[in-house]
C-alpha cells in the first residue's frame, strides 16, 4: 500500500492521460483524484500502465467505492478488471449485458478465471434466469459454460434459451446435465418438422428416454454412431434390434466396432442372438435361442 504524501507542485492530474505513466506510485496516489479517475475510466485502457501503477489506480477506486463500484465504472474497467478479486466482484451489481460483454472481452482467449466465474454468477443471479441473450453471450466466450453449471442451475434455463446452444457447447456435459436440458430442448424444438427437429435435438439426446428413441426410430433419422454412443444406457437397453436398425439406418454397421463398449455391449447382452444375427454384422453375446428371458423388474412391480 502506498503511503499518503502531498502531491508535488504542478503534478496534480487534470485528466487521465499518458503523462501518468511517468508518475511514481506515490505520485499517482497523491496526484490523481479518485472521482476524476472514475469518470475517465475508459481512458485507462489506452494507456500502457505498469501492473504496479494499476494497483494504485484500483486502490483509489476501492477507497472511493468501498461498497462496490457503480456499473458506470465497471463497464469501463478494461484490463483493470484483471486486478479485481472475486471478493471485489461480489460487491458489484451488474445488470447490463453490454457491461458483461466488455469484461468478458478482457479475459478473451483465456480459461474462465475465478473473477469471470464470479462475475457471471452475479449477473445471472441478478437477472433471475439464463435468458437467451445472456446464454448467447456466455457460450460465445466460453463454449463449455453450459456444462459447468449444476443440474439445479440448469433448471433455471428457459426453453427459449436453448435456441442459442450449439453442439460444441454440450461437449463436456454429463448425463445428469443432459437429463435437465433434453426436455427443454424437446419443448423448444417441438414445432419443427422431422429432419430439422433431429438436427437440432441430436446434441441433447444423451438425456432422451426410451420412448423418445423409439419414436425417432420411426422417422428415418439415420443417427450416427457417435450420437448413439452418448445415449443413456438405460434408455437404449429396451430398444429392439429392429428399432436400433431403423434408428441408425446405414450407420448400423458401426455397431460391430463398438460391440465391447457401452451402451452397445449392454444392449447386445439383452437381445436374442437370432435377432442380432439378422443384422449380418457378426455381433456375439446375445441370449441363446431357446432361453427364457425374465424381466425381474417387472416381476417385482407385479408382486
Amino acid at each position: 500500500e502506498v503511503e499518503k504524501t502531498a502531491c508535488p507542485s504542478g503534478k496534480k492530474a487534470r485528466e487521465i492521460d499518458e503523462s501518468l505513466i511517468f508518475y511514481k506510485k506515490w505520485e499517482l496516489e497523491a496526484c490523481v483524484d479518485a472521482a476524476l479517475l472514475a469518470t475517465q475510466m475508459d481512458r485507462v485502457n489506452a494507456i500502457p500502465f505498469t501492473y504496479e501503477q494499476l494497483d494504485v489506480l484500483k486502490h483509489k477506486l476501492d477507497e472511493l467505492y468501498p461498497q462496490g463500484y457503480p456499473e458506470s465504472v465497471i463497464q469501463h474497467l478494461g484490463y483493470l478488471f484483471l486486478k479485481m478479486s472475486p471478493e471485489d466482484i461480489r460487491k458489484w451489481n451488474v445488470t447490463s449485458l453490454e457491461t458483461l460483454k466488455a469484461l468478458l472481452e478482457v479475459n478473451k482467449g483465456h480459461e474462465m478465471s475465478p473473477q469471470v466465474a464470479t462475475l457471471i454468477d452475479r449477473f445471472v443471479k441478478g437477472r433471475g434466469q439464463l435468458d437467451k441473450d445472456t446464454l448467447d453471450t456466455l457460450t460465445a466466450f466460453y463454449p463449455g459454460y453450459l456444462c459447468s453449471l449444476s443440474p439445479e442451475e440448469l433448471s433455471s434455463v428457459p426453453p427459449s434459451s436453448i435456441w442459442a446452444v450449439r453442439p460444441q457447447d454440450l461437449d463436456t456435459c454429463d448425463p445428469r446435465q443432459l437429463d435437465v436440458l433434453y426436455p427443454k430442448a424437446r419443448l423448444a424444438f417441438q414445432n419443427m418438422n422431422g429432419s430439422e427437429y433431429f438436427v437440432k435435438i441430436q446434441s441433447f439426446l444423451g438425456g432422451a428416454p426410451t420412448e423418445d428413441l423409439k419414436a425417432l426410430s420411426q422417422q428415418n433419422v439415420s443417427m450416427d454412431l457417435a450420437t448413439f454412443m452418448k445415449l443413456r444406457t438405460d434408455a437404449v437397453l429396451p430398444l429392439t434390434v429392429a428399432e436400433v436398425q431403423k434408428l441408425l439406418g446405414p450407420h448400423v454397421e458401426g455397431l460391430k466396432a463398438e460391440e465391447r463398449h457401452r451402451p452397445v455391449r449392454d444392449w447386445i447382452l439383452r437381445q436374442r442372438q437370432d435377432d442380432l444375427d439378422t443384422l449380418g454384422l457378426g455381433l456375439q453375446g446375445g441370449i441363446p435361442n431357446g432361453y427364457l428371458v425374465l424381466d425381474l423388474s417387472m416381476q417385482e412391480a407385479l408382486s
Epitope: E18, N45, A46, P48, F49, H76, Y79, K108
Partner: nanobody
Framework: LQLVESGGGLVQPGGFLRLSCAAS????????IGWFRQAPGKEREGVSY????????NYADSVKGRFTISRDNAKNTVYLQMNSLKPEDTGVYSC????????????WGQGTSVTVSS
Amino acid sequence: LQLVESGGGLVQPGGFLRLSCAASGFTLDYYAIGWFRQAPGKEREGVSYISSSGGSTNYADSVKGRFTISRDNAKNTVYLQMNSLKPEDTGVYSCAAAGGYGNSSRYWGQGTSVTVSS
C-alpha cells in the same frame, strides 16, 4: 502473441543505443506503446510513450531532449533512440502495448538490458 525487445548492451557514458520493440502474432497499429525501465532495487518507471497513430509522444523529464520514440507500423516495431547516455540510464528496458477503448488486450515484453558504464 508477444512483444520482443532488442538492442540493449554495454555502452560508455555519452554513447547511444537504439532499442527495438517488435510485436509477434499481432499488429501494433492499434496500440499505444510505452517504454519503461527498472534499475536494480528500484521501482519500474515510465520513460517514453507514443500513441497508436504516432502523432503524440511524451517523455519522462529525466530523458527529455536525449531520447526519441518512433514507430514503423509497416515493420510492426517501435523504436527508442537513446543519445547522450548517462550511468543513471542503466536498467532493464521493456515495452508495453495498450489497446485503447474497446480493445482490452495489453502486452508486455521481457525486456533488454542497458548498462552505461566506463
